[in-house]
């Protein structure tokens, strides 16, 4: 039961995390105008990975896309790439993990296959989370670096040269969403990897035990002791006979509305 719970929770946490990474990537508030000692402003600037926006005190908001690839800073391109890689890996990981879920029965898929798929999706979630955290951190570092460079006639945000002290930008909501989402995806991935250990077929000292109701001989087939590799052994007490019973993890045996056939 613990394995299913760990796997299911890992999936849900990763799902929330990836949804957060997608949301962060699409958000416009990656950097927002620093209001320092002036909480009310007539013109408020904020920028995302794909466009920059201006909100006037009148309530009118205007957003302009960055309709250039070559003209954008390399760091911004790198952040975009990291976030997209994170989303793609996360999406593939989600797809794989759906089929790896123990509570979902797909034909006669063996536990070993599910274990491998769980491990694969777990690794994908970990890499996805790391990509998101890296992307957000690179952008945050850019902001910190540029924060004090607010002298006259300097490059400002995505704009050009101006005749005033440049607009200073600080961390936007998207950065915090990205950090949290990346962390959740990472945690979800770790949980999937932990669940994988419990899903892998158990290698015991007794490879098989034959029971013959009519016969007098009981055949023991000893199996050589195998050192655990970490993911290979199962810490659960699985029954080594097939008497029609199943472990708690295998209770759902009949197709239901949750099954993928």
């Amino acid at each position: 039961m613990a394995v299913t719970a760990c796997q299911g929770l890992g999936f849900v946490v990763s799902l929330i995390g990836i949804a957060g990474i997608i949301a962060a990537t699409c958000m416009d508030q990656w950097s927002t105008q620093d209001l320092y000692n002036n909480p009310v402003t007539a013109v408020f600037n904020y920028q995302g990975l794909w466009r920059s926006c201006v909100r006037e005190s009148s309530g009118f908001t205007e957003c302009r896309g960055y309709f250039t690839l070559l003209g954008l800073p390399a760091m911004l391109q790198a952040v975009r790439a990291l976030m997209i890689v994170g989303i793609v890996l996360g999406a593939i990981g989600l797809l794989v993990s759906i089929f790896a879920l123990k509570c979902i029965r797909i034909g006669s898929m063996e536990d070993s296959a599910k274990a491998n798929m769980t491990l694969t999706s777990g690794i994908m979630f970990i890499v996805s989370g790391l990509c998101a955290i890296a992307g957000v951190s690179v952008f945050a570092n850019m902001l910190v670096t540029n924060f004090w460079m607010s002298t006259a006639n300097m490059y400002t945000g995505m704009g050009g040269m101006v005749q005033t002290v440049q607009t200073r930008y600080t961390f936007g909501a998207a950065l915090f969403v990205g950090w949290v989402a990346g962390g959740l995806t990472l945690i979800g991935g770790v949980m999937m990897c932990i669940a994988c250990r419990g899903l892998a077929p158990e290698e015991t000292n007794y490879k098989a035990v034959s029971y013959h109701a009519s016969g007098h001989s009981v055949a023991y087939k000893p199996g050589g002791f195998k050192a655990s590799t970490g993911f290979g052994s199962n810490t659960k007490n699985k029954k080594i006979y097939d008497g029609g019973a199943r472990t708690e993890d295998e209770v759902q045996s009949y197709p239901s509305k949750h099954d993928y056939v």
């Epitope: 007539a42 201006v54 005190s57 009118f60 400002t156």
Partner: antibody, heavy 118, light 113 residues
Framework: QVQLQQPGAELVKPGTSVKLSCKAS????????THWVKQRPGQGLEWIGM????????NYNEKFKSKATLTVDKSSSTAYMQLRRLTSEDSAVYYC???????????WGQGTSVTVSS | DIVMTQSPSSLTVTAGEKVTMTCKSS????????????LTWYQQKPGQPPKLLIY???TRESGVPDRFTGSGSGTDFTLTISSVQAEDLAIYYC?????????FGSGTKLEIK
Amino acid sequence: QVQLQQPGAELVKPGTSVKLSCKASGYTFTSYWTHWVKQRPGQGLEWIGMIHPNSGSSNYNEKFKSKATLTVDKSSSTAYMQLRRLTSEDSAVYYCTRIHYGNAMDYWGQGTSVTVSS
Amino acid sequence: DIVMTQSPSSLTVTAGEKVTMTCKSSQSLLNSGNQKNYLTWYQQKPGQPPKLLIYWASTRESGVPDRFTGSGSGTDFTLTISSVQAEDLAIYYCQNDYSFPFTFGSGTKLEIK
């Protein structure tokens, strides 16, 4: 069409208070900030402050913080400005305005002429 | 606060003439985020409230005759009336819309000969 209706004139005594009204019609009152502007006879324009009818949040020119209080009544689509401790310096025409693109004041009331005299 | 300085304080012209008035701000009104200048021009005729002519330094308000043109960027702005008409007799004000408190210039009084 958009209209901002203000009473024509107010005659008040020094040291007292006056509450000026501005009734909006022809647009969604709660969607636009209402601003107030002062114009002394034969002089220029001074921005007093603004209020958002929906949230009630306001922002004042530091110069008028102790002089003016902005309020709204959403039900009647009316903005109010209370001026306190009136002196002859407060004798002026007070306009209410609405702002739109570019933070520009696109519609103005006809103005209320406040005369402070004993 | 941003100080707005208008010049000349008054000018007298004949109908049909081209008129230019200037407005200088103590700080730039150019917003880097959208590359727009937050400067507005108003026209105030005697006994009337001001009327919006131009916003974003050069965008003409709907219904305003095309003889009115706004230009400039940063700290220096100009309002041009290509061919003055008798009904243009008024005081013209420029206003900072970029930062609070919003501030107005002292005005340029246009008189017709």
